[in-house]
Amino acid sequence: HHHHHHASQPCPDPTAPPNGHISPVQATYVLKDSFSVFCKTGFELLQGSVPLKSFTAVCQKDGSWDRPIPECSIIDCGPPDDLPNGHVDYITGPEVTTYKAVIQYSCEETFYTMSSNGKYVCEADGFWTSSKGEKSLPVCKPVCGLSTHTSGGRIIGGQPAKPGDFPWQVLLLGETTAAGALIHDDWVLTAAHAVYGKTEAMSSLDIRMGILKRLSLIYTQAWPEAVFIHEGYTHGAGFDNDIALIKLKNKVTINRNIMPICLPRKEAASLMKTDFVGTVAGWGLTQKGFLARNLMFVDIPIVDHQKCATAYTKQPYPGAKVTVNMLCAGLDRGGKDSCRGDAGGALVFLDNETQRWFVGGIVSWGSINCGGSEQYGVYTKVTNYIPWIENIINNF
């Protein structure tokens, strides 16, 4: 480091800034000698407000250093980012955002949950960091499957729904009326035939939520960003793989009237056996042959798959047959069914273990005269499509 040039003046001894040290320390510093400043952990080199990764000053011929010594300032992670559908509390002290400060993220209770503990610390790299080392914000995921509707297990007929009974119910308005089920705050599950032809003409799809009355003027509006129809669905050639997903342009805010339905757990098959009762809601045709003004629901039992397939062999539906990707529900004597206008809606079941409702079926097809004797409603079997659903949502 020493270069002796007697014609030049020595530079003044450098003084280490608070929370920093100088290296090398020399008795004198002459022309071309240099020193560097290093900060303690949790402190950073700042020249005013400009951050520096390193600092070295060189002694000049006139006996001055070529740059002033920066400060070692305590790392400041800055105000933490806002958490969508949540909030942040300062644990260390009000507005304290410096090195080793702790903050706690929480989700809006009742309607959102967080998988992590939400605790973040301001670390030496200047980023808020979780106990798992994550620098990204935690996520407030919508709670799913909460409902004020209680299933008595007995068929109680088509009845008007009450607020909060079917908060996942989505009204799809296009050339025809159809339905869907919210499964995330920005994804709707529906029947492929209900949105067929809408992949390009998406602007014609009007999506409404948080309503009971079909013609209500007060609703939460959503618009589609993308429509995904199952690649195995062929329009006009039966209803196999009659399933689709709609990605919403914006996330909807979850509340007691707008909430996703849960997707089935692996154990769901045991809750959807023959004679187990599910519930379906919709604004489709009623006994009078008109679209329902108010959201209606009916509790209906699952029908033995073979029995259903045989029934539709006896009285065929043009171009359709019951496949392994379908489940049937209804009464042998008829009278309780979903109908045109209900398509895409969810057939839901209560998971007794979690006390949450989940979607087991999607209203797909059935006899032209809805609710006819041995003319069961046919639903897309959602458990067969969990990988498909997850793949689309995760890769969007």
């Epitope: 005013g48 951050p51 990764k53 800055g78 200047g126 980023f127």
Partner: antibody, heavy 118, light 105 residues
Framework: DVQLQESGPGLVKPSQSLSLTCTVT?????????WNWIRQFPGNKLEWMGY???????SYNPSLKSRISITRDTSKNQFFLQLNSVTTEDTATYYC???????????WGQGTSVTVSS | IVMTQSQKFMSTSVGDRVSVTCKAS??????VAWYQQKPGQSPKALIY???YRYSGVPDRFTGSGSGTDFTLTISNVQSEDLAEYFC????????FGSGTKLELK
């Protein structure tokens, strides 16, 4: 030698987002310093918009904080400006610049003119 | 922090000595830089930390001041020095002065 080059659309519609890219050659943006966006309005007034530091931390002009985002792609040695909800008041020449507070030479791009108009 | 360059224009002659001033609305220590900008060009850095000259900058350019009052002095003005000069504080965030245009008398 360090060089900075701005790129992006010259015309943006009101209420839309303005997105610009700064490509840096001759120096790694993760090596040191602060990598800034600065704009110059007609009439020559200069405004510092914000920076992304070598470590990836950002600092923004408080007057723009609600609608600005500066990000980077270290693999391409680029950093980016996104300014949301633009109005005609955002019409300016946008510069990217390396500022080191004297610790290493300042370098500026040549600037890119952006007009906000319907 | 507001940086005020009270003189929008300054008239000078080749060979003159001229001082461009800049006043900060609060203490900025010595965290001030000076820039020169010619029409159609990007700003060019002249001075950092109030008084340190960037390498390659002619020694006729001198910066001084600390706290709130800062001066850029050009001794022996050359025709190529006719340009607009901006101060910049980088003590708290970054703010530029409004500029002073140096023109011939």
């Amino acid at each position: 030698d360090v060089q900075l080059q701005e790129s992006g659309p010259g015309l943006v519609k009101p209420s839309q987002s303005l997105s610009l890219t700064c490509t840096v050659t001759g120096y790694s943006i993760t090596s040191d310093y602060a990598w800034n966006w600065i704009r110059q309005f007609p009439g020559n007034k200069l405004e510092w918009m914000g920076y992304i530091s070598y470590s990836g931390r950002t600092s923004y002009n408080p007057s723009l904080k609600s609608r600005i985002s500066i990000t980077r792609d270290t693999s391409k040695n680029q950093f980016f400006l996104q300014l949301n909800s633009v109005t005609t008041e955002d019409t300016a020449t946008y510069y990217c610049a390396k500022l080191g507070g004297g610790h290493g030479m300042d370098y500026w791009g040549q600037g890119t003119s952006v007009t906000v108009s319907s | 922090i507001v940086m005020t360059q009270s003189q929008k224009f300054m008239s000078t002659s080749v060979g003159d000595r001229v001082s461009v001033t800049c006043k900060a609305s609060q203490n900025v220590d010595t965290n001030v830089a000076w820039y020169q900008q010619k029409p159609g060009q990007s700003p060019k850095a002249l001075i950092y930390s109030a008084s340190y000259r960037y390498s390659g900058v002619p020694d006729r350019f001198t910066g001084s001041g600390s706290g709130t009052d800062f001066t850029l002095t050009i001794s022996n003005v050359q025709s190529e020095d006719l340009a607009e000069y901006f101060c910049l504080q980088y003590n708290s965030y970054l703010t530029f002065g409004s500029g002073t245009k140096l023109e011939l008398k």
